[in-house]
């Protein structure tokens, strides 16, 4: 049987072509440094497509290797505040389950007002992933300077 | 039937194999913000498999979600002249047809001289995805500090 | 037959799913640039999946267009060493065989203490990636600040 | 040639709000920070805030308490400032100003003479 | 806030002469430092950006000195145009900062 016919019969899923782009809802409440994000078509050109959310956090449903990527661009953003408010950094993490807690990605602003980086990491079923953002500075909601996905790449 | 064969025995496009990675070959006249991309073997190590260009723009030619990625450095550039040249922004975007206009990715230079980003997006057969660079800096032609690219990632 | 069915049946590296995740094991000696990196599940999160290291550098063993990806973070560094000890600069390219020999991507710190970025390119077995930091200034060893990958996309 | 044009003067009660608008041509809106600038009669200049057009971000002068909004809308290109529970002192000029990854500030509206008097 | 301390308040030259104001910073603020004319019944109008940089159009006898804490505007040669208030600013921090001001005036 053609793959291409296969492709069209069997659930995506059960491809493993899990895959996710969120973009920002709010951030947490004072002494909560987490940005909650929201996804849906509904939304504008985010999608959940195997992963959920969990109160604003990403939980990952399939077992594998992902690529995680970010972009978190600060909303009111100069010479000023780059520098003096340092540090604000980003930091993108596994928070639960507890036992498997561990910062995956962190970038610092410095003297910019974006950050954008990615990465291959292992990811089990029912992690979830946490964005921490440390420092004074909110950041933007725009869904083109402000997103965060992840994408099944491989068992 | 195993897959393996299965790949040999259909071409890639039927796999949803779309991907390109573009060089940057001129910036545009005056009143123009857009870049001017080009790829091929011939011109390096830029391609295209399935997406085409059209007068210097990427089109799509697959439905599916799509990882964009871009990276684009000024030709000559410090830290001062990228903030005293302010405001020096990149955005992404599906500049055609019309109707789905829109702003996918959006950097500005501030204090740095080079930007790179990546993030998923839905995209349909018939997109054509324009970069601009407003501002008054010229970006940097080489082929390992300029560049655009897109992956099919899933339908 | 299902997909699914011979996903499980075949070995993955036929299915052309070769992927690397590396940490920063250390710099080199006086007058080389070169990172050297250091992947295992035993050393944490990174892996390598098909592509092999070769005294510390990454050895690809399957041809095709891959997404290569990097950031690294400057140990101790702020927007002002990071402009006084101008340029640091990071390049990613084919450092054998010579007759390959090119750089894959470059990007200067100058006001930013983390540089990241990815592009896909063709590569093919035999290739060996070099990542090579020029400047005074040394990278941090965190496997959340400083990593460097590759991920096959397609033949 | 880039301009910003300022809605015109205003007399206000103590405790009312007046809302001046600053229209702007000649430059992409979304691609400057707008920035509003106070002046008492005879005295000097008082920052009060900023916003970035593009995403709605605004930064503000702790010395106006929360009675100072900053808005933009980025269909008419026109940026505006609020000021609620007006007081004598709050009689100035007002000015917007616009400004980039450093915050000095190149081109200035004409000035709003805002008047509270009872 | 960062106070930015103007002096003198008032400043009495003759066309053709130099004039030197001066602005003190409470805290360092490197380069962060601007500033601007004004004369009665007018918005300010950018002279100097980054503590020494003349804005476009600005005539080459305004001069700018810095940086840290002590920030000098020199006026070469006084012009009949040249008698206003000029205010520094400082944008190192915020809240944005401006100087009492320096009233230039025909001696």
């Known amino acids: 049987q053609r793959f291409a016919q296969a492709q069209q019969q069997l659930p995506l899923e059960s491809l493993g072509w899990d895959v996710a782009e969120l973009q920002l809802n709010h951030t947490g409440p004072q002494q909560d440094p987490r940005l909650y994000w929201q996804g849906g078509p509904a939304l504008g050109r985010s999608f959940l497509h195997g992963p959920e959310l969990d109160k604003g956090q990403l939980r990952i449903h399939r077992d594998g290797i992902y690529m995680v990527h970010i972009q978190v661009t600060l909303a009111i953003c100069s010479s000023t505040t780059a520098s003096r408010h340092h540090p604000t950094t980003l930091a993108v993490g596994i928070c639960s389950p507890a036992s498997r807690s561990i910062s995956l990605l962190r970038l610092s602003f410095h003297q910019g007002c974006t950050i954008a980086s990615q990465r291959l990491t292992p990811l089990a079923r029912g992690d979830t992933l946490c964005t921490n953002l440390t420092g004074t500075l909110l950041p933007s909601r725009n869904t083109d300077e402000t997103f965060f996905g992840v994408q099944w790449v491989r068992p | 039937q195993r897959f393996a064969q299965a790949q040999q025995q259909l071409p890639l496009e039927s796999l949803g194999w779309d991907v390109a990675e573009l060089q940057l070959n001129h910036t545009g006249p005056q009143q123009d913000p857009r870049l001017y991309w080009q790829g091929g073997p011939a011109l390096g190590r830029s391609f295209l498999h399935g997406p085409e260009l059209d007068k210097g723009q990427l089109r799509i030619h697959r439905d599916g979600i799509y990882m964009v990625h871009i990276q684009v450095t000024l030709a000559i550039c410090s830290s001062t002249t990228a903030s005293r040249h302010h405001p020096t922004t990149l955005a992404v975007g599906i500049c055609s047809p019309a109707s789905r206009s829109i702003s996918l990715l959006r950097l500005s230079f501030h204090q740095g001289c080079t930007i790179a980003s990546q993030r998923l997006t839905p995209l349909a057969r018939g997109d054509t995805l324009c970069t601009n660079l407003t501002g008054t800096l010229l970006p940097s032609r080489n082929t390992d500090e300029t560049f655009f690219g897109v992956q099919w990632v899933r339908p | 037959q299902r997909f699914a069915q011979a996903q499980q049946q075949l070995p993955l590296e036929s299915l052309g799913w070769d992927v690397a995740e590396l940490q920063l094991n250390h710099t080199g000696p006086q007058q080389d640039p070169r990172l050297y990196w250091q992947g295992g599940p035993a050393l944490g999160r990174s892996f390598l999946h098909g592509p092999e290291l070769d005294k510390g550098q990454l050895r690809i063993h399957r041809d095709g267009i891959y997404m290569v990806h990097i950031q690294v973070t400057l140990a101790i560094c702020s927007s002002t060493t990071a402009s006084r000890h101008h340029p640091t600069t990071l390049a990613v390219g084919i450092c054998s065989p010579a007759s390959r020999s090119i750089s894959l991507l470059r990007l200067s710190f100058h006001q930013g203490c983390t540089i990241a970025s990815q592009r896909l390119t063709p590569l093919a077995r035999g290739d060996t990636l070099c990542t090579n930091l020029t400047g005074t200034l040394l990278p941090s060893r965190n496997t959340d600040e400083t990593f460097f990958g590759v991920q096959w996309v397609r033949p | 040639e880039v301009q910003l044009v300022q809605s015109g003067a205003e007399v206000k009660k103590p405790g009312a709000t007046v809302k001046i608008s600053c229209k702007v041509s000649?430059?992409?809106?979304?691609?400057?920070?707008m920035n509003w600038v106070q002046q008492a009669p005879g005295k000097g200049l008082e920052w009060m805030g900023i916003i970035n057009p593009y995403n709605g971000g605004t930064h503000y002068n702790q010395k106006f308490k929360g009675r100072v909004t900053i808005t933009a809308d980025t269909s008419t290109d026109t940026a505006y400032m609020e000021l609620s529970s007006l007081r004598s002192e709050d009689t100035a000029v007002y000015y917007c100003?616009?400004?980039?990854?450093?915050?000095?500030?190149?081109?200035w509206g004409q000035g709003t003479l805002v008047t509270v008097s009872s | 806030e960062i106070v930015m301390t103007q002096s003198p308040a008032t400043l009495s030259v003759s066309p053709g002469e130099r004039a030197t104001l001066s602005c003190k910073a409470s805290q360092n603020v490197g380069t962060a430092v601007a500033w601007y004319q004004q004369k009665p019944g007018q918005a300010p109008r950018l002279l100097i950006y980054s503590a020494f940089n003349r804005y476009n159009g600005i005539p080459a006898r305004f001069s700018g000195s810095g940086p840290g804490t002590d920030f000098t505007l020199t006026i070469s040669s006084l012009q009949s145009e040249d008698f206003a208030v000029y205010y520094c600013q400082q944008y190192s921090t915020y809240p944005l900062t401006f100087g009492g001001g320096t009233k230039v005036e025909i001696k």
């Open positions: 000649g430059y992409t809106f979304t691609d400057y920070y």
């Open positions: 100003a616009t400004s980039g990854y450093d915050l000095y500030f190149d081109y």
